[in-house]
Interface confidence: low
Amino acid sequence: GELETSDVVTVVLGQDAKLPCFYRGDSGEQVGQVAWARVDAGEGAQELALLHSKYGLHVSPAYEGRVEQPPPPRNPLDGSVLLRNAVQADEGEYECRVSTFPAGSFQARLRLRVLVPPLPSLNPGPALEEGQGLTLAASCTAEGSPAPSVTWDTEVKGTTSSRSFKHSRSAAVTSEFHLVPSRSMNGQPLTCVVSHPGLLQDQRITHILHVSFLAEASVRGLEDQNLWHIGREGAMLKCLSEGQPPPSYNWTRLDGPLPSGVRVDGDTLGFPPLTTEHSGIYVCHVSNEFSSRDSQVTVDVLDPQEDSGKQVDLVSAS
């Protein structure tokens, strides 16, 4: 005869584990008893259950209510048992000892693996700012048994580093994603991908990158200097910049207060019909939590009666 079992039985936490033990005997042979034991390293065998051909199943007190025979129909040569609701502490070596007549005693051993699926968590790093060097963008941690695999899925260029902490019955894996922040990364997804044999499919957690920056400021509206003449209506200056967080705009006049009738509307400075008093140096001040920028322009309102041409100077400073 021969004893058939599996080297490894794998179940997910909370599932029932079938521990197989089948005696493939020659004709006329019978299974008298099957003893299942948990074999702990250096501690010997702790009996789970005895299956007697005459007396049925006897479960040891430590496993009362947790060990059952598989549902009918049952083969008299089948010594398999079900271990209900597997927990992490059940992981280990199990021994099936079959007493057969007339062949004698047979033993087989299997390993029960209880997979504990991870519950991953993603933690963003410190605020990302353009101009920083290599900076932590996010870390992703997943703990399970066996150790999960943690990787990153993103179009963003960066480097990863992983470390593992072994606990008594599980392992926690933390992977960090580092990058050199740039404004092009804004709004880009950074996805932590956790793989584990106890998961039907990979678990994914996505973090949207936010990189603080502030672009240089510039002022539009003076491109056609001939338009800035006395009496012109609808003249305006527009301050151009971009940033994260979105910047706020402020207009001032360097050589005095803003003339009456000039409207400030965020990034736009609107003029009433132009007069010579609108001539002057205007400053656009752009700021966000990250930085601030200035851009100044000189407005020279021309009198069409005068022969002299319009002179416009644009100066940017930051």
């Epitope: 065998a45 702790q46 021994e95």
Partner: antibody, heavy 120, light 110 residues
Framework: EVQLVESGGGLVQPGRPLKLSCAAS????????MAWVRQAPTKGLEWVAA????????YYRDSVKGRFTVSRDKAKNSLYLQMDSLRSEDTATYYC?????????????WGQGVMVTVSS | DIVLTQSPALDVSLGQRATISCSAS??????????IHWYQQKPGQQPKLLIW???ILTSGIPARFSGRGSGTDFTLTINPVQADDIATYYC?????????FGAGTRLELK
């Protein structure tokens, strides 16, 4: 430290009974199969009987079946071999042995042995 | 019953390699397990387990002892032999009941 100490040996007449004991210490007695192995003078080793951890199953070699009974007492951490209808060929040193904790019926610890002489 | 055959004696020199053989009358393997175990016995003492399941060294046994084999043919090797190794060596099978031992091989000095 695992210790197995046999007792109860001696000189006995053929057909008479004798009971051997084995006191176990230093390990979880109720987790292990236990066995008796004997060795006739100047001869090799011969497995005699074994018993499951619970004591619910016993195994014997054919030559002692029906005459010898192996048993165990969990409370006393003791193994016994009741030998009835002794024969001269049962003369041997009897060792109490523990089955190893892994797959395969091997004996990882042995007592010092006790001599049983069957003679008229 | 499975019969295990060992040569009665082996003459060796200290520091040399000794190879003790054990031949089974039928296969003593189940699946990938080879169920042969080796014991050492010195005069007046109980046997001591050296190797189990053909090649697994018992804790505390020196690495100069090693075992190998499969199916029906198995060997115990001692390399190098030391004076303390002079003893009788037994193989045992647990493929089926009754568990049987070889008759033993006496390791003797040349």
């Amino acid at each position: 430290e695992v210790q197995l100490v046999e007792s109860g040996g001696g000189l006995v007449q053929p057909g008479r009974p004798l009971k051997l004991s084995c006191a176990a210490s230093g390990f979880s007695f109720s987790h292990y199969d236990m066995a008796w192995v004997r060795q006739a003078p100047t001869k090799g080793l011969e497995w005699v009987a074994a018993i499951s951890p619970s004591g619910g199953s016993t195994y014997y070699r054919d030559s002692v079946k029906g005459r010898f009974t192996v048993s165990r007492d969990k409370a006393k951490n003791s193994l016994y071999l009741q030998m009835d209808s002794l024969r001269s060929e049962d003369t041997a040193t009897y060792y109490c042995a523990r089955q190893g904790p892994s797959y395969g019926y091997y004996f990882d610890y042995w007592g010092q042995g006790v001599m049983v002489t069957v003679s008229s | 019953d499975i019969v295990l055959t060992q040569s009665p004696a082996l003459d060796v020199s200290l520091g040399q390699r000794a190879t003790i053989s054990c031949s089974a009358s039928q296969s003593v393997s189940i699946s990938r397990y080879n169920l042969i175990h080796w014991y050492q016995q010195k005069p007046g003492q109980q046997p001591k387990l050296l190797i189990w399941r053909t090649s697994i060294l018992t804790s505390g046994i020196p690495a100069r002892f090693s075992g190998r084999g499969s199916g029906t043919d198995f060997t115990l090797t001692i390399n190098p032999v030391q004076a303390d190794d002079i003893a009788t060596y037994y193989c045992q099978q647990s493929r089926e009941s009754p568990f049987t031992f070889g008759a033993g091989t006496r390791l003797e000095l040349k």
